[in-house]
């Protein structure tokens, strides 16, 4: 018979034949042959593989480094990675939670809508037209553009969400 060019789900093609993939939590020791099944071995104590695979090495569980403010939220198994979270009052810097911050700052162009608390991080909002923020801050709201008119001046340069307007003297028309 013709050697296969594609294999079923949970199989892989090697040496013109279809071998079973190793199940999650196990790594590949040796490929199948005409006469033997794929040989797999369970991952070690601090290792995991979370898919049907042909990996020869398991992945190390993530380390929740207490020096970075991390602690274990969910202990890893042979099929799942460890999930880290931050100590109480701290917030993850990313979905992967690789480090912790007290709170995040809002970038220029954004103002603070709500200051962080022990349970929620800073909430930022874009500065609307007529307002700006030129700093990175964890407490400052967007500031209103300067009103040149109230100073008897005119707008020389329009404001943006990151910059204030620039006011200048009115051109006096001579009679």
């Amino acid at each position: 018979p013709e050697p296969p060019t594609a294999c079923r789900e949970k199989q892989y093609l090697i040496n013109s034949q279809c071998c079973s993939l190793c199940q999650p939590g196990q790594k590949l020791v040796s490929d199948c042959t005409e006469f033997t099944e794929t040989e797999c071995l369970p991952c070690g104590e601090s290792e995991f593989l979370d898919t049907w695979n042909r990996e020869t090495h398991c992945h190390q569980h993530k380390y929740c480094d207490p020096n970075l403010g991390l602690r274990v939220q969910q202990k890893g198994t042979s099929e799942t990675d460890t999930i880290c979270t931050c100590e109480e009052g701290w917030h993850c810097t990313s979905e992967a939670c690789e480090s912790c911050v007290l709170h995040r700052s809002c970038s220029p162009g954004f103002g603070v809508k709500q200051i962080a608390t022990g349970v929620s991080d800073t909430i930022c909002e874009p500065c609307p037209v007529g307002f700006f923020s030129n700093v990175s801050s964890a407490f400052e709201k967007c500031h209103p553009w300067t009103s040149c008119e109230t100073k008897d001046l005119v707008v020389q340069q329009a404001g943006t969400n990151k910059t204030d307007v620039v006011c200048g003297p009115q051109d006096r028309l001579r009679a």
Epitope: L68, W90, T93, V101, S105, V135, A138, F139
Partner: nanobody
């Protein structure tokens, strides 16, 4: 290496005053927003006060408004917290922090005890 060293804590009677200092080194202090936090025994972290990089804007938690004053001296790379009319509930370890407020900048803090 970024270092923030808090000092000025101690034992004070209710109604008394203290001035905390935070000496900064290892970065350009001027222009950085700075915060004071505190943690009372067995409680979570509380945001006490903040000051903008320019010193022109400040923030105070409702619990300290009108009693505490935050300031900075960029020539001395130092942040201050003047605490007046102290109450028993102000007892805590006080910490200063800088953007990006990451855990690895966290230091010892200074203990303030308000008791008669």
């Amino acid at each position: 290496e970024v270092q923030l060293l808090e000092s000025g804590g101690g034992l004070v009677q209710p109604g008394g005053s203290l001035r905390l200092s935070c000496a900064a080194s290892g970065f350009t202090f001027a222009g950085y927003e700075m915060w004071w936090f505190r943690q009372a025994p067995g409680k979570g972290l509380e945001r006490v006060s903040a000051i903008s990089g320019s010193g022109g804007s400040t923030y105070y938690a409702d619990s300290v408004k009108g009693r505490f004053t935050i300031s900075r001296d960029d020539t001395k790379n130092t942040l201050y917290l003047q605490m007046n009319s102290l109450r028993a509930e102000d007892t805590a370890v006080y910490y200063c922090a800088k953007d990006p407020y990451s855990f690895d900048y966290w230091r010892q803090g200074t203990l303030v005890t308000v008791s008669s």
